[in-house]
Amino acid sequence: MMTGTIETTGNISAEKGGSIILQCHLSSTTAQVTQVNWEQQDQLLAICNADLGWHISPSFKDRVAPGPGLGLTLQSLTVNDTGEYFCIYHTYPDGTYTGRIFLEVLESSVAEHGARFQIP
């Protein structure tokens, strides 16, 4: 039975040209995390393997930085970066947990961080 929950940074916004940290946190489970994947729609941005550490997808290596922790930092943001991002926790024995973050990249300085929320 999957008892864990993923807390994410929720709906967030940031300025074009700036950077943003995407964060997820898995709680309420004793399952061992074997790998965390970060995906944008159907594209794999990066993985953090429990044994072998961070691997940044070659197509994103100039604009994506690992961390902090299991989070991911997106740099040099463009309007095209607006959209859904997913953190996918591969665990055993529970299986897979997925968290969702929606990022809006704004032209001006009206960007504000949204509230945190939980996905069971």
Epitope: T34, Q35, E39, L44, I47, N49, L52, G53, I88
Partner: antibody, heavy 125, light 106 residues
Framework: QVQLVQSGAEVKKPGASVKVSCKAS????????ISWVRQAPGQGLEWMGW????????KYAQKLQGRVTMTTDTSTSTAYMELRSLRSDDTAVYYC??????????????????WGQGTMVTVSS | DIQMTQSPSSLSASVGDRVTITCRAS??????LNWYQQKPGKAPKLLIY???SLQSGVPSRFSGSGSGTDFTLTISSLQPEDFATYYC????????FGGGTKVEIK
Amino acid sequence: QVQLVQSGAEVKKPGASVKVSCKASGYTFTSYAISWVRQAPGQGLEWMGWISAYNGNTKYAQKLQGRVTMTTDTSTSTAYMELRSLRSDDTAVYYCARDLSSFWSGDVLGAFDIWGQGTMVTVSS
Amino acid sequence: DIQMTQSPSSLSASVGDRVTITCRASQSISSYLNWYQQKPGKAPKLLIYAASSLQSGVPSRFSGSGSGTDFTLTISSLQPEDFATYYCQQSVPPRTFGGGTKVEIK
């Protein structure tokens, strides 16, 4: 085609070191992890550890910690396994093996789809 | 570390027989279980990964099932080239193999 080619057989004295090489071809070396597995004569398979060819990070089996070092040379697409302070019970065939899934498949499965031909290491005085 | 127990350690069978090999994990490993075939003097060959996925190029007479702690490799109709030793391997770090099952000609 995709293959891993290992260095030749070695005979070593107890206390010595051995370094086995594993040259990859036919795929993007840095997109996969390489594991090392050994098999003593007439015995089963033992996982020794693995290395990311992307970033060089390693994880070793607890019983070999401190005696084994795994490295890669991305310029030649070659993985290396060095075992130090050899004992007679290190006599085995040593295999390198590629992880089934590339890092960019999103799932590093810890299953081994491509294997080297094996390198026999004999430790004897 | 997770221990993998394979049974039987050896078996005798005839061409055309249905053969079943079992593997039990000392704790739940979800579907992190792989099966290999090894012939004398050769490297192991991956047959099944993630408990039930058939590796590319492997004949469909091989199948895998199970999850949690109990897993099975089935050869639906044994062929002459199938006489070999079979190993299960769990891929939860640190990875461990079962002791092997030798399939011999009856």
